[in-house]
């Protein structure tokens, strides 16, 4: 599930300033921990890289929705 991965107190201090093509993304995690300075999204790419992104950006929200739908459609 895109948002069910538990990353112990991982925070985003900087976010990517360019769009990542949706076909490169595998999953995401919401960061809302109180010990983090801001809410953020960590995208995991198909190459295994983790990238912080700003959930206020339209491309980030669209990518999250797309991954949610993909995940749901993969369920048996």
């Amino acid at each position: 599930q895109p948002d069910s991965v538990s990353i112990p107190i991982t925070c985003c201090f900087n976010v990517i300033n360019r769009k990542i093509p949706i076909q490169r993304l595998e999953s995401y995690t919401r960061i809302t921990n109180i010990q983090c300075p801001k809410e953020a999204v960590i995208f995991k790419t198909k190459r295994g890289k983790e990238v912080c992104a700003d959930p206020k950006e339209r491309w980030v929200r669209d990518s999250m929705k797309h991954l949610d739908q993909i995940f749901q459609n993969l369920k048996p």
């Epitope: 599930q1 895109p2 948002d3 069910s4 919401r30 809302t32 300075p37 801001k38 809410e39 959930p55 206020k56 929705k65 949610d68 739908q69 995940f71 749901q72």
Partner: antibody
């Protein structure tokens, strides 16, 4: 530690307006969205709308569109909700809450607004 | 708008009981579901987001499951402090909507 502190209870006449404030500490409000949710006595929760304090962009439940104004002052880390043309059905506890994802992890203590002639 | 139907609206249970509350959306909400606990005179408290993700500090007796339109909150062994009203909320699309609530009372 995140805290959202709201203004005190209000008693208003039908047809008037009310403005409720929500002062945030422990977070930068421009990094998040500030939402307003209300709860009538003995009833459930109802989302009214939200603001992106970074740019002032707002989104509302169409039910409240035109009657509610949400603003934010980033210099004082305060969000405001003003509801106009009050009627008795607007008697409720009004909560502010934060959440960029659409769910709400921190809430104010609530402000009781009573509309009565 | 997406409507959320929660059931039951109230239930009576004893300490130690397993309690299940269900929430049904009028359309697929793709796991964008949150659960809250509210006690009288207090603001709601977030328990679960993303249908299954337990918030920090929430006891493990609370769990969430489901997908598509149908979701469940389970309290595996009810404790005295769990007597409260529980709400589900969808955050797939605005306007964000809540279920009508389930009041868990002492039997």
């Amino acid at each position: 530690q995140v805290q959202l502190v709201q203004s005190g209870a209000e008693v208003k006449k039908p047809g008037s307006s009310v403005k409720v404030s929500c002062k945030a500490s422990g977070l930068t409000i421009s990094d998040t969205y500030m939402h307003w949710v209300r709860q009538a006595p003995g009833q459930g929760l109802e989302w009214m709308g939200r603001i992106d304090p970074a740019n002032g962009n707002t989104k509302f439940d169409p039910k409240f569109q035109g009657r509610v104004t949400i603003t934010a002052d980033t210099s004082t880390s305060t969000a405001y909700m003003e509801l106009s043309s009050l009627r008795s059905e607007d008697t409720a506890v009004y909560y502010c809450a934060r959440g960029v994802f659409g769910f709400f992890d921190y809430w104010g203590q609530g402000t009781t607004v009573t509309v009565s002639s | 708008d997406i409507q959320m139907t929660q059931s039951p609206s109230s239930l009576s249970a004893s300490v130690g009981d397993r309690v299940t509350i269900t929430c049904k959306a009028t359309e697929d909400i793709y796991n964008r579901l949150a659960w809250y606990q509210q006690k009288p005179g207090k603001a709601p408290k977030l328990l679960i987001s993303g249908a299954t993700s337990l918030e920090t500090g929430v006891p493990s007796r609370f769990s969430g499951s489901g997908s598509g339109k149908d979701y469940t909150l389970t309290i595996s062994s009810l404790q005295p402090e769990d007597f409260a009203t529980y709400y589900c909320q969808q955050f797939w699309s605005a306007p964000y909507t809540f279920g009508g609530g389930t009041k868990v009372e002492i039997k």
